[in-house]
């Protein structure tokens, strides 16, 4: 077993006075392992959205190649983020608001060719990165779904699903489904096509809605659908509200697998002040479900800091030359290059969290229990069987707080120890690896802690 480090010495029951039947010492002293759940690839880590390939490509050497080829060149960087899938595009031909000139089977030459895309798929597969294609039809136009020609569009989508599944994509995304009439039944049909090809393929639907009832009605008829929405962006960034949103959602969806993001497409900085970015990264990576990020979230990319850049798709800041429009507007600590060299950067935090999320059983598929920790705080435990357990404590407030962890809220299977080791803090200055007394836990403003402790029988 993953969590047992002692040797399995085979001894016989005869040694114990019974009939001869080989059993292990482990069977004698450890409880039976809980059976591992079946996990799909999108359960094992984060998804990374690249809605605008040209903006992601940036300036400089990136401009040497068509965006799809350029993206292939960035795969090693994406591997370093340990993301499990890329959500790309849309990249199909779409003349604004013109159904006849929208072809979901053709790649817009501005992005590259079908050959480039095939090459990207091959390279991504070699690096164990999956590719999800966004097929939102009228992405350049006013209404993403050409509201007046729903049936024509739905047929185009069906044909596109079959075409791109054959081409080797790992899944699809459709956004703005609040603008799609009869969305639930169309999604059910598209889900059938996708899953009919292979259970290993994924359909993601995105909505701008933050209304739980609307979200639940979309999920009702689609059991394996992954839905991104604006649900969490309504939190008002307070601990209590976020806790209630998360627990409400999990209870209402019957603990089915879900995704966590603040919107269907936009950057975290569209919703959060800079001081909360680390806290939200920690939360998104440790809630039960698939975290979904947009390119640039790992560095805190902020369109508002880049004059003239579109809010929904600012240029990716690879290095200081990425935004030549205004010399000096970009400092090293805003860029991938600068943050890669700084162990205390947001990017370094993202990498560490992504690494933990993709390898720890308790974070991969562990149970989740939220419990009271005092006003302004959101805290929860993730645990799986006899594996290492994780405690997350988040201070959304502007003031330092002492945490009053109410262990009495927790079931017996998830009890808290007196001390837990600090795996990481979102703020500098704490000694990682040091044991912290949970009764005396104090958090700085906007600080999040990830603590770990062993299973105790």
């Amino acid at each position: 077993h993953h969590h047992h480090h002692h040797e399995q010495k085979l001894i016989s029951e005869e040694d114990l006075g019974g009939e001869q039947k080989l059993i292990s010492e482990e069977d004698l002293r450890a409880p039976r392992c809980r059976e591992l759940p079946a996990q799909k690839w999108w359960h094992t880590g984060a998804l990374y959205r690249i809605g605008d390939l040209q903006a992601f490509q940036g300036h400089g050497a990136g401009n040497l190649a068509a965006p799809i080829s350029g993206l292939k060149g960035r795969l090693d960087y994406l591997s370093s983020l340990k993301v499990k899938g890329l959500v790309l595009g849309p990249i199909h031909k779409n003349q604004k608001d013109d159904v006849a000139q929208t072809d979901l089977l053709q790649i817009d030459p501005n992005f590259g060719s079908k050959e480039d895309f095939d090459s990207l798929l091959q390279s991504a597969k070699k690096k164990s990165i999956r590719v999800i294609l966004d097929l939102t039809p009228n992405y350049r136009g006013e209404n993403s779904w050409f509201s007046t020609q729903v049936d024509t569009v739905a047929t185009k989508v069906k044909d596109a699903l079959e075409f791109w599944l054959q081409a080797g994509v790992d899944g699809f995304q459709v956004r703005d489904i609040e603008n799609l009439k009869d969305a639930s039944s169309f999604l059910a049909e598209w889900q059938n096509i996708t899953k009919g090809f292979s259970e290993d393929r994924l359909l993601i639907a995105g909505t701008n809605s933050s209304d739980l009832q609307q979200i639940l009605s979309l999920l009702e008829s689609n059991k394996d659908l992954l839905l991104t929405s604006s649900y969490l962006s309504d939190s008002g960034s307070t601990g209590e509200h976020t806790k209630s949103l998360v627990t409400q959602y999990l209870n209402a969806t019957g603990n089915r697998w879900c995704s966590w993001s603040l919107s269907q497409a936009r950057l975290l900085t569209s919703f959060l002040p800079a001081q909360l970015l680390r806290l939200y990264q920690l939360m998104l990576f440790t809630l039960p479900g698939t975290p979904v990020f947009s390119y640039g979230d790992e560095i805190g990319l902020d369109a508002a800091a880049l004059p003239g850049q579109p809010m929904e798709a600012p240029v990716m800041l690879w290095d200081e030359s990425s935004f030549p429009d205004i010399p000096g507007a970009v400092s090293a600590n805003m860029t991938v290059k600068g943050q890669s060299e700084d162990p205390g950067s947001l990017l370094s935090l993202f990498r560490r969290l992504s690494d933990q999320r993709s390898k720890e059983r308790s974070l991969l598929h562990g149970d989740f229990h939220a419990f009271s920790a005092g006003p302004g705080l959101f805290s929860y435990i993730r645990h799986w069987d006899q594996n290492e357990r994780f405690l997350v404590v988040l201070n959304f407030g502007d003031v330092g707080l002492s945490a009053g962890l109410q262990a009495s809220d927790l079931p017996a299977s998830a009890s808290l120890p007196a001390k837990a080791d600090l795996l990481l803090s979102t703020q500098p200055g704490r000694e990682e690896g040091s044991p912290l007394e949970l009764e005396r836990l104090k958090l700085e403003p906007h600080e999040g802690l990830l603590l770990r402790f062993p299973y105790a029988a």
Epitope: G60, A61, G62, N63, L64, A65, A66, I68, S69, G70, K72, G73, R74, L75, D76, Y77, S80, P109, G112, S113, E115, D116, W318, D319, V336, K337, S340, E341
Partner: antibody
Framework: QVQLVQSGAEVKKPGASVKVSCKAS????????ISWVRQAPGQGLEWMGW????????NYAQKLQGRVTMTTDTSTTTAYMELRSLRSDDTAVYYC???????????????????WGQGTLVTVSS | DIQMTQSPSSLSASVGDRVTITCRAS??????LNWYQQKPGKAPKLLIY???SLQSGVPSRFSGSGSGTDFTLTISSLQPEDFATYYC??????????FGQGTRLEIK
């Protein structure tokens, strides 16, 4: 399969210009960049510059700035390198090479040259 | 500009020998280093990219290592067809792209 086929050898007088072509086939021409690299007799390799066949962006080596122009014709999938005001030390074999991008941990893009033309000898002599 | 210095500039070896060529950058280039082989009258051929990744179709006797400023190309067991000139190339700080001056590998 990917091929880059260059124009034939040229002999030029000092002060003249030369235009070398590089016809690409076997891949989507507009999806990659083309670099030009030269090699004087018995010497090493010297990068001259690149052009993006995707958008026409160019970047030239500092020492050649003002004398070199790189262009592409997407209809014929051909790249061109013109060098003006030729001097005797421009005598070299000129290569075109396809530039493929790759990145590392810090997101910086590296460029490798995965396919090369056969080379064009340009001799500058009075 | 980043300078690339190869050593030795030439070496003699026999078939079956293990050979190492080094390349030093004047400043850190992370792992952005490629190796090429060039035979007389022919265009260079890519062997290794990103310091240690083998280009497809290149025999596994070629390997690369290093990062920062110091890099090596190793040929584990020289074959007759390996006698050629080898160049390193950096592309970390581009433009400009710069090559090493070359290492000529001759038959002993």
């Amino acid at each position: 399969q990917v091929q880059l086929v260059q124009s034939g050898a040229e002999v030029k007088k000092p002060g003249a210009s030369v235009k070398v072509s590089c016809k690409a086939s076997g891949y989507t021409f507009t999806s990659y960049g083309i670099s030009w690299v030269r090699q004087a007799p018995g010497q090493g390799l010297e990068w001259m510059g690149w052009i993006s066949a995707y958008n026409g962006n160019t970047n030239y080596a500092q020492k050649l700035q003002g004398r070199v122009t790189m262009t592409t014709d997407t209809s014929t999938t051909t790249a061109y390198m013109e060098l003006r005001s030729l001097r005797s030390d421009d005598t070299a074999v000129y290569y075109c090479a396809r530039g493929e991008l790759y990145s590392g941990y810090d997101g910086t893009l590296g460029i490798l040259f995965d396919y090369w033309g056969q080379g064009t000898l340009v001799t500058v002599s009075s | 500009d980043i300078q690339m210095t190869q050593s030795p500039s030439s070496l003699s070896a026999s078939v079956g020998d293990r050979v190492t060529i080094t390349c030093r950058a004047s400043q850190s280039i992370s792992s952005y280093l490629n190796w090429y082989q060039q035979k007389p009258g022919k265009a260079p051929k890519l062997l290794i990219y990103a310091a240690s990744s083998l280009q497809s179709g290149v025999p596994s006797r070629f390997s690369g290592s290093g990062s920062g400023t110091d890099f090596t190309l190793t040929i584990s067991s020289l074959q007759p067809e390996d006698f050629a000139t080898y160049y390193c190339q950096q592309s970390y700080s581009t433009p400009p792209i710069t090559f090493g001056q070359g290492t000529r590998l001759e038959i002993k």
